[in-house]
């Protein structure tokens, strides 16, 4: 399993990570208080056949070419979670893992 | 977490679970012993925003609305092994759970 | 340098009412939640409230609930604590402090005497 | 609400000492305790967040450990200038509470 890195310099057009910092400030949500901003990541780029493909279903798929079945895309096929303090609306300050929110790898399904 | 499940006659254009026999015979692979076929699933459709997100990092990309990133796509979101017997390759038949063979639910990310 | 300055501390008798005020420069303080802890005379600390950074949140303990109103201005970079029916037990020095994941920046305090 | 059971409540230490305050809390609280230094007459000071992240311009001879249940405050080695009380404090969930304290003082 692996992921191509890219930046705002790079020249790959192929399915890539790119680095996002989110500013929960920035979006006016002032019920999460910690981070303020955190290292979120984002899959950008084309997927040509087989390349980075996560699952071997994607390539079943392809072959079968059912219809109105799209191409592959470029999306995250790993991701880590991040703790946050957060108020939860019920007057209640709440410290939590919250799941899936940051992409350390992207693929093709 | 739910996904939609369409077959071929739907008019659904949201991102939806389809269902598709995968035909190894068909696809002439022969090394594959069991099973000649299964019910392997897909995902096509629209993902319109907020619909179907599977990860909050979907939600918070659109916001920042980074240089490149396209919408969510309709994928996989959930998924399972089959079991099958194969021909490895050297002359050794194999039997094993191979994993993501199975869409059971379609999302956007 | 972060500073935070609380005032309007002072004796008050029981039943009565007073507000604090915390000044705050050095930080961006409406980017910040922001917390008010006191700590009775010889005793340990125990959390009084927590106000979100645009002010929509706020959070407190039993002990204080329905009595006690915290607030900000933030365009006066102030943080307040309304305090009424005040108990006897209310005896502390209230301090204000900047909210992260912990409480991370602290002022040096405000006597509140609750006593008749 | 979250019980903080610090120990000891005090201790007396020569300066070069490696020092260990232990927190117990009520219930699992992941990795969210705070430790706190108090002198008297002063603020507390943040030292450590999120069980074992050092603030900002704390000396790396403070640190912090422990997940769940059972967490530590260690000083590797004592400097004169940390004699003083420390407490815990759990920010898993409101109402946030802390230690009733350590006293360090020199033996």
């Known amino acids: 399993d692996f992921g191509l890195d890219c930046d705002e310099h790079s020249t790959e057009s192929r399915c890539c990570r790119y680095p996002l910092t989110v500013d929960f400030e920035a979006f006016g949500w002032d019920w999460i208080i910690a981070p303020k901003r955190y290292k979120a990541n984002y899959c950008s780029g084309e997927c040509e056949f087989v390349f980075l493909q996560k699952y071997p279903h994607t390539h079943l798929v392809h072959q079968a070419n059912p219809r109105g079945s799209a191409g592959p895309c470029c999306t995250p096929t790993k991701m880590s979670p991040i703790n946050m303090l957060y108020f939860n609306g019920k007057e209640q300050i709440i410290y939590g893992k919250i799941p899936a929110m940051v992409v350390d790898r992207c693929g093709c399904s | 977490d739910f996904g939609l499940d369409c077959d071929e006659h739907s008019t659904e254009s949201r991102c939806c679970r389809y269902p598709l026999t995968v035909d190894f015979e068909a696809f002439g692979w022969d090394w594959i012993i069991a099973p000649k076929r299964y019910k392997a699933n897909y995902c096509s459709g629209e993902c319109e925003f907020v619909f179907l997100q599977k990860y909050p990092h979907t939600h918070l990309v659109h916001q920042a609305n980074p240089r490149g990133s396209a919408g969510p796509c309709c994928t996989p979101t959930k998924m399972s092994p089959i079991n099958m017997l194969y021909f490895n390759g050297k002359e050794q038949i194999i039997y094993g759970k191979i994993p993501a063979m199975v869409v059971d639910r379609c999302g956007c990310s | 340098e972060v500073q935070l300055l609380e005032s309007g501390g002072g004796l008050v008798q029981p039943g009565g009412s007073l507000r604090l005020s915390c000044a705050a420069s050095g930080f961006t303080f409406s980017s910040y939640a922001m917390s008010w802890v006191r700590q009775a005379p010889g005793k340990g600390l125990e959390w009084v409230s927590t106000i979100s950074s645009g002010g929509s949140y706020t959070s407190y303990p039993d002990s204080v609930k329905g009595r006690f109103t915290i607030s900000r201005d933030n365009s006066k970079n102030t943080l307040y604590l309304q305090m009424n029916s005040l108990r006897a037990e209310d005896t502390a020095v209230y301090y204000c402090?900047?909210?992260?994941?912990?409480?991370?920046?602290w002022g040096q305090g405000t006597l509140v005497t609750v006593s008749s | 609400d979250i019980q903080m059971t610090q120990s000891p409540s005090s201790l007396s230490a020569s300066v070069g000492d490696r020092v260990t305050i232990t927190c117990k809390a009520s219930?699992?609280?992941?990795?969210?305790v705070a430790w706190y230094q108090q002198k008297p007459g002063k603020a507390p000071k943040l030292l450590i967040y999120?069980?074992?992240s050092l603030q900002s311009g704390v000396p790396s001879r403070f640190s912090g450990s422990g997940s769940g249940t059972d967490f530590t405050l260690t000083i590797s080695s004592l400097q004169p200038e940390d004699f003083a009380t420390y407490y815990c404090?759990?920010?898993?969930?409101?109402?946030?509470?802390f230690g009733g304290g350590t006293k360090v003082e020199i033996k």
């Open positions: 219930q699992d609280v992941s990795t969210a």
């Open positions: 404090q759990q920010h898993y969930s409101t109402p946030w509470t």
């Open positions: 402090a900047k909210q992260d994941y912990a409480m991370n920046y």
């Open positions: 999120a069980a074992s």
